[in-house]
């Protein structure tokens, strides 16, 4: 099943997020991803957990998953590099770098997103954009077109309350509000963008969606700058 959803969001402006990628398994959307370099897409490590026997590809330049669009192109994956410390049973280090079979053809609808290198927290209350092709309601409806939602960042202390994520949110993770509007499993690997810069990647741990006491969890890319740079080098 696809890992994720944008709950309570709205349809994104077509091709206004040219960094947005759909990580696909056997031709179907599995996870979100974000183009961070001409030949590299950043996603979540857990996305490929069940993909051992399938064909993983990356769709770039898409708004609709099904309709023909001039900018759309499906790339094979040359190499999949999960973070070495990622594990199936934790949300920590949930990052994956996918090397495309060739450099992406860049244009207005396909362009890498600058990512945050300064290792500091996003200030609570800052509004950040998260986008994806995940399920849009609790009935499980999957959208054909890219959805997005603007969410306020939540402070770590609140997110770590016993009633919320009970201490699971390390300094390498961040949270955003989840009151009826949320990212969720199937949006895993997708980007959390604050002020036009990639700050977080949707984690793919299982959690209830759209419940304000279970905020969305995102991996802070700045905390992994050294690893990203070493893989991209």
């Amino acid at each position: 099943p696809p890992r994720g959803r944008i709950l309570g969001g709205r349809e994104a402006e077509a091709h206004a997020r040219p960094y947005m990628a759909s990580v696909q398994l056997n031709g179907a959307h599995l996870c979100g991803g974000v183009l961070v370099a001409e030949q590299w897409v950043l996603s979540a490590a857990h996305c490929l957990e069940d993909a051992a026997d399938g064909k993983v590809q990356v769709l770039l330049g898409a708004h609709s998953l099904s309709q023909p669009e001039p900018s759309k192109r499906l790339y094979d994956v040359l190499r999949a590099v999960p973070h070495p410390d990622s594990q199936p049973d934790t949300i920590d280090h949930d990052l994956l770098l996918l090397q495309l079979s060739e450099k992406a053809t860049l244009g207005p609808a396909v362009r890498p997103l600058p990512w945050q290198r300064v290792d500091r927290d996003v200030a609570p209350g800052t509004l950040c954009d998260v986008a994806g092709w995940g399920i849009v309601n609790h009935a499980g409806r999957r959208p054909d077109s890219l959805q997005h939602v603007l969410l306020p960042v939540l402070d770590r202390a609140t997110c770590n309350r016993r009633t919320h994520h009970d201490g699971a949110i390390t300094e390498r993770l961040m949270c955003a509000e989840s009151n009826r509007r949320d990212s969720c499993k199937g949006d895993s690997g997708g980007p959390l963008v604050c002020g036009g810069v990639l700050e977080g990647v949707v984690t793919s741990g299982s959690r209830v969606c759209g419940n304000r006491k279970k905020p969305g969890i995102y991996t802070r890319v700045a905390s992994y700058a050294a690893w990203i740079d070493s893989v991209l080098a």
Epitope: E13, A123, L127, R180, R181, V193, G195
Partner: antibody, heavy 121, light 107 residues
Framework: QVQLQQSGPELVKPGASVKISCKAS????????INWVKQRPGQGLEWIGW????????YYNEKFKGKATLTVDKSSSTAYMLLSSLTSEDSAVYFC??????????????WGQGTSVTVSS | DIQMTQSPASLSVSVGETVTITCRAS??????LAWYQQKQGKSPQLLVY???NLADGVPSRFSGSGSGTQYSLKINSLQSEDFGNYYC?????????FGGGTKLEMR
């Protein structure tokens, strides 16, 4: 076109409360944050807080917690701000304003015309 | 809370001149800043968002720049309709505070 139409001027007594409204039209009301901003006569602007009509989520400036309460009525596409325990310090023009989307960015792009609140005995 | 210090507080200029208004944040706000113009008795109007992006319908003589804690709004070849008050506002964490304003007056 996007419009935010605010209620008319209010003259209220110290200690009383007042509820001002902001009726939205020309866009999907539940999809956009509504901010409230205070401007004292001849002074600058102060951010009071925002509400997201789709969920009712609110964020307040600590300074206005207990003073301002933000609500919405989705059926009429109207945002409200209740100001309580009014003093002369609350005499000001209050603006509602929408946060709009620009690709993955956002900005407070449309403003109401303002509602003047005068607190006087 | 992040403080926004705007300067100058007032500026007396002539039509055709170029002016620069600055806004300094008490800490890094990572370009999460907007500029507004407000005429007497009117609502503020968005000019620039995320430090450098010109809002729809804003003349190209306006431009925003800056990063970190220092931001500027530049108006080239000032027109008569540009006189009024200008405010910056940050969006890096709540509360989204405004600068104290700059009053642009005709000399």
């Amino acid at each position: 076109q996007v419009q935010l139409q605010q209620s008319g001027p209010e003259l209220v007594k110290p200690g009383a409360s007042v509820k001002i409204s902001c009726k939205a039209s020309g866009y999907s009301f539940t999809d956009y944050y509504i901010n409230w901003v205070k401007q004292r006569p001849g002074q600058g602007l102060e951010w009071i807080g925002w509400i997201f009509p789709g969920s009712g989520s609110t964020y307040y400036n600590e300074k206005f917690k207990g003073k301002a309460t933000l609500t919405v009525d989705k059926s009429s596409s109207t945002a409200y701000m209740l100001l309580s325990s009014l003093t002369s310090e609350d005499s000001a023009v209050y603006f509602c304003a929408r946060t709009g989307y620009y690709s993955n960015l956002y900005a407070v792009d449309y403003w109401g015309q303002g509602t003047s609140v005068t607190v006087s005995s | 809370d992040i403080q926004m210090t705007q300067s100058p507080a007032s500026l007396s200029v002539s039509v055709g001149e170029t002016v620069t208004i600055t806004c300094r944040a008490s800490e890094n706000i990572y370009s999460n800043l907007a500029w507004y113009q407000q005429k007497q008795g009117k609502s503020p109007q968005l000019l620039v968002y995320v430090a450098t992006n010109l809002a729809d319908g804003v003349p190209s003589r306006f431009s925003g720049s800056g990063s970190g804690t220092q931001y500027s709004l530049k108006i080239n070849s000032l027109q008569s309709e540009d006189f009024g008050n200008y405010y910056c506002q940050h969006f890096w964490g709540t509360p989204y505070t405004f600068g104290g304003g700059t009053k642009l007056e005709m000399r």
